[in-house]
């Protein structure tokens, strides 16, 4: 009897949907996996024989709840399946934002880019899949814990009145209000202040 | 919620032409990819044209230089001209929307579209 994969999971970020599993403990020899959809009552091969332990599933409708399934096979044998249930615009993990920030004297001037659609075309990003698309920022002065959070109205946000000649941190996250679901952080991003009317070149 | 209609189907000889149409509604995206899906009975529901919100198409093997796949956006209407039809094109049509999609490298299966019409019969007969 061939064992099922194992750990079988969907590791989505942004739409770009791969199923991932384990290798199941096997004496016999080396297992091959397919994983397939389900389409309209009938199952469809995505991945036939692979050696791998994923397989890509990004071109689901990012709309529809897709039921996906993966086998370990060996010679002619075959485990069960093992199914799991997707749907992406409700399951996918919204990816950190870009941020671009400059400093202007005592603020802060800052600008959000939305993740880009895994997949689809470069000026497609999460923001036109959501609606209800916004941003979350947090701030803090380096090297303290208190954390400021804001939430910008527009792809743009500036912090002003900031303390001079001090380095702030500045991170940004996709939210979606309608679903209350929030997306991963962005990496911090570290400027310190001057206290002069300098133009940021 | 976003709405398709078709129609044009009906009855027809082989080597006629029909005129399926698609209308939409209920938009809330500004940008679709769109296709054209049959079902003959007892069989899978498979892929016949798409075409991306830049207007690029494609076509299943079996109806490449018969068929004709386009849209009008100011109507939100999608086509498909039917050409040289023979029997086997005998099927329930479907239309199907997905937003934020490119047709390019997708494989025309249903499951990649989110949105369906209820269909519209055609019939060819020898």
């Known amino acids: 009897m061939v064992p099922p994969p194992e750990n079988v999971r969907m590791n989505s970020v942004n739409f770009k949907n791969i199923l991932q599993w384990e290798s199941p403990a096997f004496a016999k020899g080396n297992l091959t996996f397919t994983a397939q959809y389900l389409s309209y009552r009938i199952f469809q091969d995505k991945c036939m024989n692979t050696t791998l332990t994923e397989c890509d599933f990004s071109s689901l409708s990012k709309y529809g709840d897709h039921t996906l399934r993966v086998r370990a096979e060996f010679a002619d044998e075959h485990s069960d399946w093992v199914n799991i249930t997707f749907c992406p615009v409700d399951d996918t993990i919204i990816g950190p934002p870009g941020m671009q920030v400059e400093v202007l004297a005592d603020s802060l001037h800052m600008r959000f880019l939305a993740p880009k659609i895994e997949n689809e075309y470069e000026t497609w990003t999460m923001k036109n899949v959501y609606n209800s698309w916004t941003y979350n920022v947090q701030y803090w002065k380096n090297g303290t814990d208190e954390k400021f959070q804001i939430t910008p109205q527009y792809d743009f946000e500036v912090l002003r009145n900031l303390e001079p000649w001090t380095t702030y941190c500045v991170q940004v996250r996709g939210f979606l209000p309608d679903r209350n679901k929030a997306g991963e952080w962005s990496e911090p991003v570290c400027e310190q202040t001057t206290h002069d009317e300098t133009v940021p070149s | 919620q976003v709405q398709l209609q078709e129609s044009g189907g009906g009855s027809v000889q082989a080597g006629g032409s029909l005129r399926l149409s698609c209308a939409a509604s209920g938009y809330t995206y500004s940008s679709y990819c769109m296709g054209w899906f049959r079902q003959a009975p007892g069989k899978e529901r498979e892929g016949v044209a798409a075409i991306d919100s830049d207007g690029s198409t494609s076509y299943a093997d079996s109806v490449k230089g018969r068929f004709t796949i386009s849209k009008d956006n100011a109507k939100n209407t999608l086509y498909l001209q039917m050409n040289s039809l023979k029997p086997e094109d005998t099927a329930m049509y479907y239309c199907?929307?997905?937003?934020?999609?490119?047709?390019?490298?997708?494989?025309?299966?249903?499951?990649?579209?989110?949105?369906w019409g209820q269909g519209t019969q055609v019939t060819v007969s020898s």
């Open positions: 199907a929307a997905e937003p934020w999609c490119t047709s390019q490298g997708r494989g025309r299966e249903s499951a990649e579209f989110g949105y």
